[in-house]
C-alpha cells in the first residue's frame, strides 16, 4: 500500500513542482525577455538594433504619381477647374545609404547622426522612364509671385516671365520635376539667386539632420526618441507646442508597445511632428505586428480639433482656419507656397479640392500606416503617403496669372514610400525574437498544464486509494 501511495504522492509532488516551475517561469521568463530586449534595442555598437539602425536591411522604395494637367490653357484663360490625370508609379530606391557622422555622447546617453539622401530609379518597377514629360504648374512663377506680393516687383517679374516665354504651366520631364532643372525665368534675374528648381531639389548628395537621439542606455523607454534636430528642440516653423520635435523618426519606437499608446514621431518631409494610433492586429510574414495609422483627426481644422490651432498659420487660404486636410509649410520651404496633404486630398475639406477635377481619394491606397512589432518596437513595414501641392494666386501685374479669379492649391505629385522586412530578415526575426518568445511561452504552458494535470490526477488517485484502504 505504501509503495502505491508513495508513488502517487511523488507524482503529485512532481506535478506541483512542474506547475510551480511553470508559474515561476512566467515572470522570470518575461524578465529574461525584457532583459534581452532591453540589451538588444539599445543604440550602441554590438546590438541587433544598432546594426539595423545604421543601415536599414529593408529595401525602401519611393513611388511617385505625377498629376498631369490636361487643360492648361483653359485654366490660364478662363480660371477653369484644373483637370488632372495621375501618372505613375515611377519608383526609386531610397534610404539605402548608411547613417553618417555617428557620434555617441555618453554624457547625455545620446547618439547623433546624419541621414544621407539618395535615389536610384527602378525602371522595372515604373510605368515609364525619367524622360517622360508632364504638364505641371510652373513652380518658379507660382513661387515668385507668392514670395514677392509687392506690386512693383510683380511688374518686374512679369517682364522676366514674358521675356523667358514662361507661362502658368510648363512641360517638364520626371527627372527635371523631381530633381531639378535650370529655370529660364529665374535665369534672367540679374542677382545671384538659385536658378535651379525642383520638387526635391537638392536631394542626391545631401543629408537630413543632424539628428540627436537617445540611445536608451539610461532608460529604454527613451530609445530612438529625438532629443534635438539640427541642434534645436524646436523647429521655429510653428507657434507653441506645434513647434516641438516629438517622438522618434518612426523607424522604431521604444520597446513593449501597447495598443492604447499614441505613437508620436517627427517627419522632416512635412516639417512637423505627428502621431499614429492603433488600428488592428496584422500578421506580417509570421510575425504578429500592430498596425498604427495616422488618424483623420491629425489633419482636422482647429474647429474640429482645437489641438491643431497652431498649425493654422494664415487666415485667407484656410478660410479663417476652417479648411482642413492641408498643411501650409511655406515657412519651412524658404517662403515657397508649398502645401502638404494626403494623396488626392484624402481627409481634406471640400473647398480644398473643389478647384481640381480628377481626384479619387481612397483610404486604403492613400493613408499612412506603420506596422510595429510590439516587443522590440521595430517598424517592420510601413507606407508613408503624402502629396505635395503648390498654391497659385491671381496677380493683376503678372500677365500669365492675370485671368485667374481664385486661388488654387495645385497638386503636383503624390508619393508612397514603403518598406517591408525581407524574407530572410523575417525568418531571422522569427527565430531570434518571436520564436524564442513563443517557445518560452509554450514551455511555460506545457510545464504549467502538465504539472497541474499531474498534480490533480495523482492527488485524485491518492485520495481514491486512501478511501478504499480506510473502508
Amino acid at each position: 500500500g505504501c509503495d502505491r501511495n508513495c508513488g502517487l504522492i511523488t507524482g503529485a509532488v512532481i506535478g506541483a513542482v512542474l506547475a510551480v516551475f511553470g508559474g515561476i517561469l512566467m515572470p522570470v521568463g518575461d524578465m529574461l525577455i525584457q532583459k534581452t530586449i532591453k540589451k538588444e534595442v539599445v543604440l550602441e555598437e554590438g546590438t541587433i538594433a544598432f546594426k539595423n539602425w545604421v543601415k536599414t536591411g529593408t529595401e525602401i522604395y519611393r513611388q511617385f504619381w505625377i498629376f498631369d494637367v490636361q487643360n492648361p490653357q483653359e485654366v490660364m484663360m478662363n480660371s477653369s477647374n484644373i483637370q488632372v490625370k495621375q501618372r505613375g508609379p515611377y519608383t526609386y530606391r531610397v534610404r539605402f545609404l548608411a547613417k553618417e557622422n555617428i557620434t555617441q555622447d555618453p554624457k547625455d546617453n545620446t547618439v547623433s547622426f546624419l541621414q544621407p539622401n539618395g535615389a536610384i530609379f527602378e525602371p522595372s518597377l515604373s510605368v515609364g522612364t525619367e524622360a517622360d514629360n508632364f504638364t505641371v504648374l510652373n513652380l518658379a512663377v507660382a513661387a515668385a509671385s507668392h514670395i514677392y506680393p509687392n506690386p512693383f516687383v510683380q511688374v518686374v517679374l512679369n517682364s522676366l516671365i514674358n521675356k523667358s516665354k514662361s507661362s502658368m504651366f510648363q512641360v517638364r520631364t520626371l527627372r527635371e520635376l523631381l530633381w531639378g532643372y535650370t529655370d529660364p525665368f529665374l535665369s534672367l534675374v540679374p542677382y545671384p539667386v538659385s536658378t535651379r528648381v525642383g520638387m526635391f531639389y537638392p536631394y542626391n548628395n545631401t543629408a537630413d539632420g543632424v539628428y540627436k537621439v537617445f540611445n536608451g542606455k539610461d532608460s529604454i523607454s527613451k530609445v530612438a526618441i529625438i532629443d534635438t534636430y539640427k541642434g534645436k528642440r524646436n523647429l521655429s516653423y510653428w507657434e507653441s507646442y506645434c513647434d516641438m520635435i516629438n517622438g522618434t523618426d518612426a523607424a522604431s519606437f521604444p520597446p513593449f508597445v501597447e495598443k492604447s499608446q499614441v505613437l508620436q514621431f517627427f517627419s522632416s518631409d512635412i516639417c512637423r511632428s505627428i502621431y499614429a494610433v492603433f488600428e488592428s492586429d496584422v500578421n506580417l510574414k509570421g510575425i504578429p505586428v500592430y498596425r498604427f495609422v495616422l488618424p483623420s483627426k491629425a489633419f482636422a481644422s482647429p474647429v474640429q480639433n482645437p489641438d491643431n490651432h497652431c498649425f493654422c498659420t494664415e487666415k485667407i487660404i484656410s478660410k479663417n482656419c476652417t479648411s482642413y486636410g492641408v498643411l501650409d509649410i511655406s515657412k519651412c520651404k524658404e517662403g515657397k507656397p508649398v502645401y502638404i496633404s494626403l494623396p488626392h486630398f484624402l481627409y481634406a475639406s471640400p473647398d480644398v479640392s473643389e478647384t481640381i477635377d480628377g481626384l479619387n481619394p481612397n483610404e486604403e491606397e492613400h493613408r499612412t500606416y506603420l506596422d510595429i512589432e510590439p516587443i522590440t518596437g521595430f517598424t517592420l513595414q510601413f507606407a508613408k503617403r503624402l502629396q505635395v501641392n503648390l498654391l497659385v494666386k491671381p496677380s493683376n501685374k503678372i500677365q500669365v496669372l492675370k485671368r485667374l479669379k481664385r486661388n488654387y492649391i495645385v497638386p503636383i505629385l503624390w508619393l508612397n514610400e514603403t518598406g517591408t522586412i525581407g524574407d530572410e530578415k523575417a525568418k531571422m526575426f522569427r527565430s531570434q525574437v518571436t520564436g524564442k518568445i513563443n517557445l518560452l511561452g509554450l514551455i511555460e504552458m506545457i510545464l504549467l498544464s502538465v504539472g497541474v494535470v499531474m498534480f490533480v490526477a495523482f492527488m485524485i488517485s491518492y485520495c481514491a486509494c486512501r478511501s478504499k484502504t480506510i473502508k
Epitope: 511688374v155 518686374v156 517682364s159 522676366l160
Partner: antibody, heavy 117, light 107 residues
C-alpha cells in the same frame, strides 16, 4: 565697375524739347531696368519715369505723363528720356538710376535741365 | 499714390550723438522701404533697402527698422561725414515715392 553717365541737359525755352541720355557700363540695362529721378533746386527727390527690364513696361509720374517718353537702346546700353512741352517746373537736376527691386543702388552724377525764357 | 512723410525736416546734432529719423507711409508698404544719404551737389547714395538691410559698404552705425507704415533710420554715433540730407523711399508700388528729406546739420 557699374557706372551711369547722364548727358543732354541744358537750357531750353518753355514748350521746347530735350532728350537726355543715360549711358550704362558694367551691367546690361536690359536686365535691370532704368529710372529717371529729378531734383528741383533746393527741393527733394521726385521719381519721374521707369522702363522695366527687357522693355516690358514703362511707367510715368502723373506730372510728366503724356509729355515725357522713356526708352532704351540695348545695343548701345543706353536709356533715354525724351522731354517735350517742357515747363518751368520741370527745371531740375535729372538723375538716371539702376533698380531691379525698386530701390536705387547706382545713380548717375546728374544733368541739369533749365526751362526758362 | 503712397505718400511718405519724413520727420523732422531738419535737426542739429553733434559728433557722437545718436540720431533717429522717422518716416511714415500713408498705407502699408510691408518692409519695402529704402533710405538714402545725399550731400550737396552729389547724387544720393543707398544706405538701406527692405527697411532693415544694410547696403554693402555702408558703415554699421547706420541701421533701419520698422514694418507696415512706420520706419526709422538710426545713426548710432554721428560722424563728421554723416552731415547730409537723408531720404526715405517706398519701393512697394509704382509710382515710387520719396519722403521730403531730413537735413542733419552740425550743432
Amino acid at each position: 565697375e557699374v557706372q551711369l553717365v547722364e548727358s543732354g541737359g541744358g537750357l531750353v525755352q518753355p514748350g521746347g524739347s530735350l532728350r537726355l541720355s543715360c549711358a550704362a557700363s558694367g551691367f546690361t540695362i536690359d536686365a535691370f531696368g532704368i529710372h529717371w529721378v529729378r531734383q528741383a533746386p533746393g527741393k527733394g527727390l521726385e521719381w519721374v519715369a521707369w522702363i522695366a527690364p527687357y522693355g516690358g513696361y514703362t511707367y510715368y509720374a502723373d506730372s510728366v505723363k503724356g509729355r515725357f517718353t522713356i526708352s532704351a537702346d540695348t545695343s548701345k546700353n543706353t536709356a533715354y528720356l525724351q522731354m517735350n512741352s517742357l515747363r518751368a517746373e520741370d527745371t531740375a537736376v535729372y538723375y538716371c538710376a539702376r533698380s531691379f527691386f525698386g530701390y536705387f543702388d547706382y545713380w548717375g552724377q546728374g544733368t541739369l535741365v533749365t526751362v526758362s525764357s | 499714390d503712397i505718400q511718405m512723410t519724413q520727420s523732422p525736416s531738419s535737426l542739429s546734432a553733434s559728433v557722437g550723438d545718436r540720431v533717429t529719423i522717422t518716416c511714415r507711409a500713408s498705407q502699408d508698404v510691408s518692409n519695402w522701404v529704402a533710405w538714402y544719404q545725399q550731400k550737396p551737389g552729389k547724387a544720393p547714395k543707398l544706405l538701406i533697402s527692405y527697411a532693415t538691410s544694410l547696403y554693402s559698404g555702408v558703415p554699421s552705425r547706420f541701421s533701419g527698422s520698422g514694418s507696415g507704415t512706420d520706419f526709422t533710420l538710426t545713426i548710432s554715433s554721428l560722424q563728421p561725414e554723416d552731415f547730409a540730407t537723408y531720404y526715405c523711399q517706398q519701393h512697394s508700388n509704382a509710382p515710387l515715392t520719396f519722403g521730403q528729406g531730413t537735413k542733419v546739420e552740425i550743432k
